[in-house]
């Protein structure tokens, strides 16, 4: 018998110093580029091999961005998501929000898969 | 991590139509750009076309313009590639590439435009 998908949000305060190539991430969504159905919030699509994000290691393809430098993300635009992010300055403290899917099967198994978007 | 598996390669003769399909799975295929690169006998692995995530920007190498055509289809997770008069030399292992589709955070101007994350096995298209 299948066990049905549960999702385990958690949320996470990433702070990333601006490389030589930048932040080393890309983005989708805003309120003109819905990524998910009903939500235009901004979500991490990319990250860039060998760039600060990725050095980091802890933001993940999927992730949620709720704010920059503790400016809400809420109902922007994709493009003033995008010049938000490129005028952030050389330290950077992003507030994400991570979903972790989680398979609930028969009673005491249960397995985690990769992060989803 | 993305899986990427190519399919319909094969033998053809010179001015024949082949179809390669690609099938992603791993993460959301919606926000995943795609490209088609093949690597001949002897030369480096070259961009052939790319679909971004949205599918309302495509780029096709001159030399296939106008015999090519890439798509996608979100609901199957799979790209496409329509090969149609084929010449001797589309002979090569075609590959399917996926990268992270958006904007990039970091310039206008990403200078990686054709580096791609994730690739496929690859698949040969011999044209005889």
């Known amino acids: 018998m299948n066990g049905r998908v549960d999702y385990l949000v958690t949320e996470e305060e990433i702070n990333l110093t601006r490389g030589p190539s930048g932040l080393g991430f890309n983005i989708v969504g805003g309120t003109d580029q819905q990524y998910v159905s009903n939500d235009s919030g901004i979500y991490v699509s990319r990250i860039k091999e060998n760039g600060a994000a990725a050095l980091d290691g802890r933001l993940q393809e999927g992730d949620k961005i709720l704010s920059v430098n503790g400016q809400d993300l809420k109902n922007l635009l994709h493009q003033d998501a995008v010049d938000l992010f490129r005028n952030a300055g050389y330290a950077v403290s992003l507030r994400v929000q991570h979903r972790l899917q989680v398979q609930n099967g028969p009673i005491g198994h249960r397995g985690e898969g990769d992060p989803s978007g | 991590e993305v899986q990427l598996v190519e399919s319909g390669g094969g033998l053809v003769q010179a001015g024949g139509s082949l179809r390669l399909s690609c099938a992603a799975s791993?993460?959301?295929?919606?926000?995943?750009?795609m490209g088609w690169f093949r690597q001949r006998p002897g030369k480096e692995r070259d961009v052939v076309a790319t679909?971004?995530?949205?599918?309302?920007?495509?780029y096709y190498l001159d030399s296939v313009k106008g015999r090519f055509t890439i798509s996608r289809d979100n609901a199957k997770n799979t790209v496409f590639l329509q090969m149609n008069s084929l010449k001797p030399e589309d002979t090569a292992v075609y590959y399917c590439?996926?990268?992270?589709?958006?904007?990039?955070?970091?310039?206008?101007?990403?200078?990686?435009?054709?580096?791609?994350?994730?690739w496929g096995q690859g698949t040969q298209v011999t044209v005889s």
């Open positions: 590439a996926a990268r992270g589709g958006g904007s990039s955070v970091d310039s206008e101007y990403d200078a990686g435009e054709f580096e791609y994350d994730y």
């Open positions: 679909i971004n995530w949205t599918g309302d920007s495509t």
């Open positions: 791993g993460r959301p295929f919606s926000s995943l750009d």
